[in-house]
């Protein structure tokens, strides 16, 4: 798969493949994988990709299911790249406070916060 | 501060305190703090709280600015708790796939994805 494919298109294609291959992926009825119990997905990327690794090792490869796991590995690459960008730029305190304010604003409006 | 205060209320109060104390916090003109260069904030919680730590060590404590840093420390506690919940429950593959689908769906619709 060319890595030049835009990440947004990659995500869309992966969603479709995930749906198509659901019964193949759940063929191992006894396998158990850690599943986060909240919806703040970005906090759990490490565990999600560990789970994907477990699933891949238990899944017969070939055809488009192989493409699914390739896509997921490219998505992981993208996310790892984003994580690297978390600490790359050293800026003035004003700019850090702006980011902190945005972060708390997002927490305030978009996070699913349990009591 | 009683930890019983709901996290949502804590976040709101912290946003207000951040605004109130902005000039005090930016008093150190030479200080530089790593600032993420993208808006997928949840990926950068570690760096954000490291930055808060740097800022706290450089800020004269007392009064409500102390309350601001206490709040931020409680928010960190909440996020650390959420991160712990990423891998607590081992479930069937079906449920892992549901979570993965939600995660990709959120990436598809809510993430700011650069080409």
């Amino acid at each position: 798969i060319p890595t030049e494919i835009p990440t947004s298109a990659l995500v869309k294609e992966t969603l479709a493949l995930l749906s198509t291959h659901r019964t193949l992926l759940i063929a191992n009825e006894t396998l158990r994988i850690p599943v986060p119990v909240h919806k703040n997905h970005q906090l759990c990327t490490e565990e999600i990709f560990q789970g994907i690794g477990t699933l891949e090792s238990q899944t017969v490869q070939g055809g488009t299911v192989e493409r699914l796991f390739k896509n997921l590995s490219l998505i992981k690459k993208y996310i790892d790249g984003q994580k690297k960008k978390c600490g790359e730029e050293r800026r003035r305190v004003n700019q850090f406070l702006d980011y902190l304010q945005e972060f708390l604003g997002v927490m305030n409006t978009e996070w699913i916060i349990e009591s | 501060i009683p930890t019983e205060i709901p996290t949502s209320a804590l976040v709101k109060e912290t946003l207000a305190l951040l605004s109130t104390h902005r000039t005090l916090l930016i008093a150190n003109e030479t200080l530089r703090i790593p600032v993420p260069v993208h808006k997928n904030h949840q990926l950068c919680t570690e760096e954000i709280f490291q930055g808060i730590g740097t800022l706290e060590s450089q800020t004269v404590q007392g009064g409500t600015v102390e309350r601001l840093f206490k709040n931020l420390s409680l928010i960190k506690k909440y996020i650390d708790g959420q991160k712990k919940k990423c891998g607590e429950e081992r479930r069937r593959v079906n449920q892992f796939l549901d979570y993965l689908q939600e995660f990709l769906g959120v990436m598809n619709t809510e993430w700011i994805i650069e080409s």
């Epitope: 659901r22 019964t23 063929a27 119990v37 | 449920q95």
Partner: antibody, heavy 119, light 107 residues
Framework: EVQLVQSGAEVKKPGASVKVSCKAS????????IHWVRQAPGQGLEWMGY????????VYNEKFKSRVTMTRDTSISTAYMELSRLRSDDTAVYYC????????????WGQGTMVTVSS | EIVLTQSPATLSLSPGERATLSCRAS??????MHWYQQKPGQAPRLLIY???NLASGIPARFSGSGSGTDFTLTISSLEPEDFAVYYC?????????FGGGTKVEIK
């Protein structure tokens, strides 16, 4: 159009077995799980288990584990549910239902097969 | 196994009224709750999946909410065809279980 068509009503003696079929059409049979749910007269719904048509793997409700067998024939897009050692309290309408995928809701149902167990 | 308790057992309402049906789980099941409608002599029909998502072809007057142990199905304005039995169902834990049903009848 998705359709699940079940076999006709059955009358069985206690101790006998019954095999109900469920023919799927309008979608790719191997891409969705098939569940079996029963409903005794005037009662609520009871989940019996499911079969994965792709792999043939099954997950059964512990209550039925020793008596139920779910199979499928992918060549004719049909799932089967066999219940053995029938008792009078197995008298019920037996439904097959397709699993909708994400979060596993039962999105399409067969018309039901009435199984009467009586001596 | 997770026990689902539906209340009330019977709900007597007139067309146009709002119906609120409750389903309580004996233990937390995140949002793995689905709702079905069943009319006499018919198979159940999926209305709401994963607590709050409207199933395909279902009118927008049906809505679901809740998470954890408490869930609600709401019919904003009852139509004559809505008088039926409603079941909640969980699939967070095996075995999957259904509630005992709530009958919505014409007052």
């Amino acid at each position: 159009e998705v359709q699940l068509v079940q076999s006709g009503a059955e009358v069985k003696k206690p101790g006998a077995s019954v095999k109900v079929s469920c023919k799927a059409s309008g979608y790719t049979f191997t891409e969705y799980l098939i569940h079996w749910v029963r409903q005794a007269p005037g009662q609520g719904l009871e989940w019996m288990g499911y079969i994965n048509p792709y792999s043939g793997g099954t997950v059964y409700n512990e209550k039925f584990k020793s008596r139920v067998t779910m199979t499928r024939d992918t060549s004719i897009s049909t799932a089967y549910m066999e219940l053995s050692r029938l008792r009078s309290d197995d008298t019920a309408v037996y439904y097959c239902a397709r699993d909708g995928g994400y979060s596993d809701p039962l999105d399409y149902w067969g018309q039901g097969t009435m199984v009467t167990v009586s001596s | 196994e997770i026990v689902l308790t539906q209340s009330p057992a019977t709900l007597s309402l007139s067309p146009g009224e709002r119906a609120t049906l409750s389903c309580r789980a004996s233990e937390g099941l995140t949002s793995y709750m689905h709702w079905y409608q069943q009319k006499p002599g018919q198979a159940p029909r999926l209305l709401i999946y994963k607590a709050s998502n409207l199933a395909s072809g279902i009118p927008a007057r049906f809505s679901g909410s809740g998470s954890g142990t408490d869930f609600t199905l709401t019919i904003s304005s009852l139509e004559p065809e809505d008088f039926a039995v409603y079941y909640c169902q969980q699939n967070w834990n095996d075995p999957w279980t259904f509630g005992g049903g709530t009958k919505v009848e014409i007052k």
